[in-house]
Interface confidence: low
């Protein structure tokens, strides 16, 4: 709930945003922090054995509006969430895997597409 007198205007995007990065850290990152003119993201996807893997990092401004608004196709088993409101905001993002849709099944382990 907003406190009385608190502005309801959206927080302007910082010129340089710092994000937590995990599995998507650039070589020059320090302490698992990357910097971007765009968005922080957290993503969950399945690995080859069907286990969920969470990664996080920075998305550049160019093209990231499309990425972040683009909820993945359900059967991709991948979901990405983005934020810009403060530094390291992606620590608080918790995307969930969408359900299976039109997955190809083979004998034994699940075959991805």
């Amino acid at each position: 709930k907003k406190e009385d007198g608190e502005s309801t205007a959206p927080t302007p995007r910082p010129k340089v945003l710092r994000c937590k990065c995990h599995h998507h850290c650039p070589e020059d990152s320090v302490n698992n922090i990357c910097s971007t003119d765009g968005y922080c993201f957290t993503m969950i996807e399945e690995d080859d054995s069907g286990l969920p893997v969470v990664t996080s990092g920075c998305l550049g401004l160019e093209g990231s509006d499309f990425q972040c608004r683009d909820t993945p196709i359900p059967h991709q088993r991948r979901s990405i969430e983005c934020c810009t409101e403060r530094n390291e905001c992606n620590k608080d993002l918790h995307p969930t895997l969408p359900p299976l849709k039109n997955r190809d099944f083979v004998d034994g382990p699940i075959h991805h597409r």
Epitope: H24, T55, L59, E62, G63, F66, Q67, N102, R113
Partner: antibody
Framework: QVTLKESGPGILQPSQTLSLTCSFS??????????VGWIRQPSGKGLEWLAH???????SYNPALKSRLTISKDTSNNQVFLKIASVVTADTATYYC????????WGQGTLVTVSA | DIVMSQSPSSLAVSVGEKVTMSCKSS????????????LAWYQQKPGQSPKLLIY???TRESGVPDRFTGSGSGTDFTLTISSVKAEDLAVYYC?????????FGAGTKLELK
């Protein structure tokens, strides 16, 4: 600014392998979530999705053509490739590449004619 | 596979007329987790590549005139042009991006009466 451009052989004979290249700028296939797809359109007919590739090298194919299709990418050179084996005259079409899974950006298309 | 059916296959219209065209899917395109319909509409003019008009069934792509409106949910969708202009004469395709294989409708051709 996102641009995509397809290139191909123009004409080839039945039973040959069709090799297509999609060269793009303004997007990177190393960006998490990014994907590029191939769609074709025979003259005067509708659109048919062929194949898709994601930044992490996941691939998806049209089941009706899967045995003949191979999609691949060269991330560093901003290119995606499609090969169609054992072409027949019914593969004559304009071939497009496009970004994403709802296709906000398309190339201009390249016409491929399969003729003996 | 999800089958997309469009009607009518062609439509003769006069400039200034209101036009509606239909797209039906063989299964629901509504994803309950985010309440979004995974449906897009494209316009293709002769000799040109298709152009994205509408995504999420009703969201207008940037730069698309507001005379184009997408509506519907689940399996029944409609594209409406409130007042047709000569430049709107084209073929209109719907496409589902709910699951692979991605599929298109056969198109509705808009012609001058």
């Amino acid at each position: 600014q996102v641009t995509l451009k397809e290139s191909g052989p123009g004409i080839l004979q039945p039973s040959q392998t069709l090799s297509l290249t999609c060269s793009f700028s303004g997007l990177s296939l190393s960006t998490p979530g990014m994907s590029v797809g191939w769609i074709r359109q025979p003259s005067g007919k509708g659109l048919e999705w062929l194949a898709h590739i994601w930044w992490n090298d996941d691939k998806s194919y049209n089941p009706a053509l899967k045995s003949r299709l191979t999609i691949s990418k060269d991330t560093s050179n901003n290119q995606v490739f499609l090969k169609i084996a054992s072409v027949v005259t019914a593969d004559t079409a304009t071939y497009y590449c496009a970004r994403g899974d709802r296709f906000a950006y398309w190339g201009q298309g390249t016409l491929v004619t399969v003729s003996a | 596979d999800i089958v997309m059916s469009q009607s009518p296959s062609s439509l003769a219209v006069s400039v200034g007329e209101k036009v509606t065209m239909s797209c039906k899917s063989s299964q629901s395109l509504l994803y309950s987790n985010n309440q979004k319909n995974y449906l897009a509409w494209y316009q293709q003019k002769p000799g040109q590549s298709p152009k994205l008009l509408i995504y999420w069934a009703s969201t207008r792509e940037s730069g698309v005139p507001d005379r184009f409106t997408g509506s519907g949910s689940g399996t029944d969708f409609t594209l409406t042009i409130s007042s047709v202009k000569a430049e709107d004469l084209a073929v209109y395709y719907c496409q589902q991006y709910y699951s692979f294989p991605l599929t298109f409708g056969a198109g509705t051709k808009l012609e001058l009466k």
